[in-house]
């Protein structure tokens, strides 16, 4: 499956929007840093089948969408930027869904890569728990925004590697 050229442009736009969501100087938030245990192994090449990679990427973007579409995120972040961010993520999801269906068929994919998908879900659960424990403070959002930017960048790198293998 060939992801459209607009897909990588959408990735870049999503990253720019994440960067623009900054509300306070991050320098005041050093003490709030947290290890979310990003599931790096799910984004390494290993013996990754393309279909598995696409499923993991889809889950990553879906969970990012979920995280940023809560009422707490709407209260903490710029709504105009959030709306643009949702549009970009929605397009990413559509692109990847088309790919998943082409690669493995819609029935098999969620079951075949359950462990990888579960690892991504648990990662986002840790992020949500952190935000809850920190009472959705400005610094907590700043830390999460930085973390999502990092994980998003790693997702983009995985997509680039997939493309180069075609």
């Amino acid at each position: 499956c060939d992801l459209p050229q607009t897909h990588s442009l959408g990735n870049r736009r999503a990253l720019i929007l994440l960067a623009q969501m900054r509300r306070i100087s991050p320098f005041s938030c050093l003490k709030d840093r947290h290890d979310f245990e990003f599931p790096q192994e799910e984004f390494d090449d290993k013996q990754f089948q393309k279909a598995q990679a696409i499923s993991v990427l889809h889950e990553m973007i879906q969970q990012t969408f979920n995280l940023f579409s809560t009422k707490d995120s709407s209260a903490a972040l710029d709504e105009t930027l959030l709306d643009e961010f949702y549009i970009e993520l929605d397009q990413q999801l559509n692109d990847l869904e088309s790919c998943v269906m082409q690669e493995v068929g819609v029935i098999e994919s969620p079951l075949m890569y359950e462990d990888s998908i579960l690892a991504v879900r648990k990662y986002f659960q840790r992020i949500t728990l952190y935000l809850t424990e920190k009472k959705y403070s400005s610094c907590a959002w700043e830390v999460v925004r930085a973390e999502i930017m990092r994980s998003f960048s790693l997702s983009i790198n995985l997509q680039k590697r997939l493309k180069s293998k075609e």
């Epitope: 991050p26 320098f27 050093l30 003490k31 709030d32 840093r33």
Partner: antibody
Framework: EVQLVQSGAEVKKPGESLKISCKGS????????IGWVRQMPGKGLEWMGI????????AYSPSFQGQVTISADKSISTAYLQWSSLKASDTAMYYC??????????????WGQGTLVTVSS | DIQMTQSPSSLSASVGDRVTITCRAS??????LNWYQQKPGKAPKLLIY???SLQSGVPSRFSGSGSGTDFTLTISSLQPEDFATYYC?????????FGQGTKVEIK
């Protein structure tokens, strides 16, 4: 390979201006902050300030606030440290180092080789 | 500002010795404490981050412990290349601050 390459040694007179540089390569320059550290002859390490190259947001140590300016040009992956009017007491080795920002990763894991600044009349 | 106090300021030791350097913060800094090694004419090198995590490529004879205000860097068996100055540094808050350094010399 991650590298921070600093500009060469400088010999200046008191009152002169100076801008030294730190060029990052082998990683995403805007994904890390760049910190500056001073080491006067025979002395310890002193943190001067830091910059987020993604938007040029800066923070300074109170000891250096107003004495130096930290800037960055992300288009050429370079951070700068500058003085508008040097003093003899600015004679020191200056290091840049990368910092992971708010990400859970090692602080100051890569350092530049240092720029020796000598201020003498 | 958070003050970082290292002790001792210098120490003499022999190859094979176990060496311990301590660092005390003026207020609790959690585990946001790093250790660096610096040799004359060279840039500092990160050894330990987040109080106890060994930086990639650093020999396992180096270890770090502590949290809150009291921290320790231990070299289990001193090697000839370990004679250097060691600095602790807090990254809990801005301004970031370093300890004054501990010089490890040959006995």
């Amino acid at each position: 390979e991650v590298q921070l390459v600093q500009s060469g040694a400088e010999v200046k007179k008191p009152g002169e201006s100076l801008k030294i540089s730190c060029k990052g390569s082998g990683y995403s320059f805007t994904s890390y902050w760049i910190g500056w550290v001073r080491q006067m002859p025979g002395k310890g390490l002193e943190w001067m300030g830091i910059i987020d190259p993604s938007d040029s947001d800066t923070a300074y140590s109170p000891s250096f606030q107003g004495q130096v300016t930290i800037s960055a040009d992300k288009s050429i992956s370079t951070a700068y440290l500058q003085w508008s009017s040097l003093k003899a007491s600015d004679t020191a080795m200056y290091y840049c180092a990368r910092h992971p920002g708010l990400n859970w990763a090692p602080d100051f894991d890569y350092w530049g080789q240092g720029t020796l600044v000598t201020v003498s009349s | 500002d958070i003050q970082m106090t290292q002790s001792p300021s210098s120490l003499s030791a022999s190859v094979g010795d176990r060496v311990t350097i301590t660092c005390r913060a003026s207020q609790s800094i959690g585990s946001f404490l790093n250790w660096y090694q610096q040799k004359p004419g060279k840039a500092p090198k990160l050894l330990i981050y987040f109080a106890s995590s060994l930086q990639s490529g650093v020999p396992s004879r180096f270890s770090g412990s502590g949290s809150g205000t009291d921290f320790t860097l231990t070299i289990s068996s001193l090697q000839p290349e370990d004679f250097a100055t060691y600095y602790c540094q807090q990254s809990y808050s801005i301004p970031i601050t370093f300890g004054q350094g501990t010089k490890v010399e040959i006995k």
